[in-house]
Interface confidence: medium
């Protein structure tokens, strides 16, 4: 015998109290399949957490975040606090990156300088707290004789002292 | 019951100063990060500031840093936001929250379940 619950659409629940007839998802609650018995409260976003999208009766509200923050997790179940490039985030807020390391984004951890010598290669340019070093062509080919390399400008000043 | 309570909104000219409080009862206060946000007329709820449960992390909006400072007062279950150098874009209403999720600069969904009812500050000549 064919459940009757199973002809309920989404966005619909099927209504015990009422001979399992389909019922619409009462207001602020979603059934994103059908053959649902219950609907699904609404994700609200509030604080931090903005509306990317709004809830319908077939499908929840998505958050993002409000500026400042940026997404963690699946479906933005975090909101973190963005860095400035050159910085990382740190148990006492965003610090810079220690000399020798880099971070190019608002988020994530500063990561070491590449080390071009271990490619046999050397330094175009030097490395900030917010760039990667690049690396030119092995000293090798810079020697007398071997076709000449006119490096790019650089698009920054060089690397900064430690600190 | 778990409450609230915000104070010291106002009128000020542009370039002065105002100390709001957030007076919090019937939770362990100082189990909580607490946070303010603004909402300016016609505009959607803002952050503002936000300080750990010990008062040690503290994180502020763009909007407002150098000229704001948030600080708590656990043994008096009170919450502070000084406002100096205001400017007209700071009218707003003020609201503080508590949120018991907290860590490492990131709030965790679901975790803002304290709110106040505002305090309204207008910076106007």
């Known amino acids: 015998l064919q459940d009757p619950c199973s002809n309920c659409p989404a966005g619909t629940f099927c209504d015990n109290n009422r001979n399992q007839i389909c019922s619409p998802c009462p207001p602020n609650s979603f059934s994103s399949a059908g053959g649902q018995r219950t609907c699904d409260i609404c994700r609200q976003c509030k604080g931090v957490f903005r509306t990317r999208k709004e809830c319908s009766s077939t499908s929840n509200a998505e958050c993002d975040c409000t500026p400042g923050f940026h997404c963690l997790g699946a479906g933005c179940s975090m909101c973190e606090q963005d860095c400035k490039q050159g910085q990382e985030l740190t148990k006492k807020g965003c610090k810079d990156c220690c000399f020798g390391t880099f971070n190019d984004q608002k988020r994530g951890i500063c990561r070491p300088w590449t080390n071009c010598s271990l490619d046999g290669k050397s330094v175009l340019v030097n490395g900030t707290k917010e760039r990667d070093v690049v690396c030119g062509p092995s000293p090798a080919d810079l020697s007398p004789g071997a076709s000449s390399v006119t490096p790019p400008a650089p698009a920054r000043e060089p690397g900064h002292s430690p600190q | 019951e778990v409450q609230l309570l915000e104070s010291g909104g106002g009128l000020v000219q542009p370039g002065g100063s105002l100390r709001l409080s957030c007076a919090a009862s019937?939770?362990?206060?100082?189990?909580?990060?607490m946070s303010w946000f603004r909402q300016a007329p016609g505009k959607g709820l803002e952050w503002v500031a936000v300080i750990s449960d010990d008062g040690s992390n503290k994180y502020y909006a763009d909007s407002v840093m150098g000229r704001f400072t948030i600080s708590r007062d656990n043994s008096k279950n009170t919450l502070y936001l000084q406002m100096n150098s205001l400017r007209a874009e700071d009218t707003a209403m003020y609201y503080c929250a508590g949120h018991y999720d907290y860590v490492w600069g990131s709030f965790r969904y679901g975790a803002f379940d304290i709110w106040g009812q505002g305090t309204l500050v207008t910076v106007s000549s």
């Open positions: 019937g939770f362990t206060f100082g189990d909580y990060a």
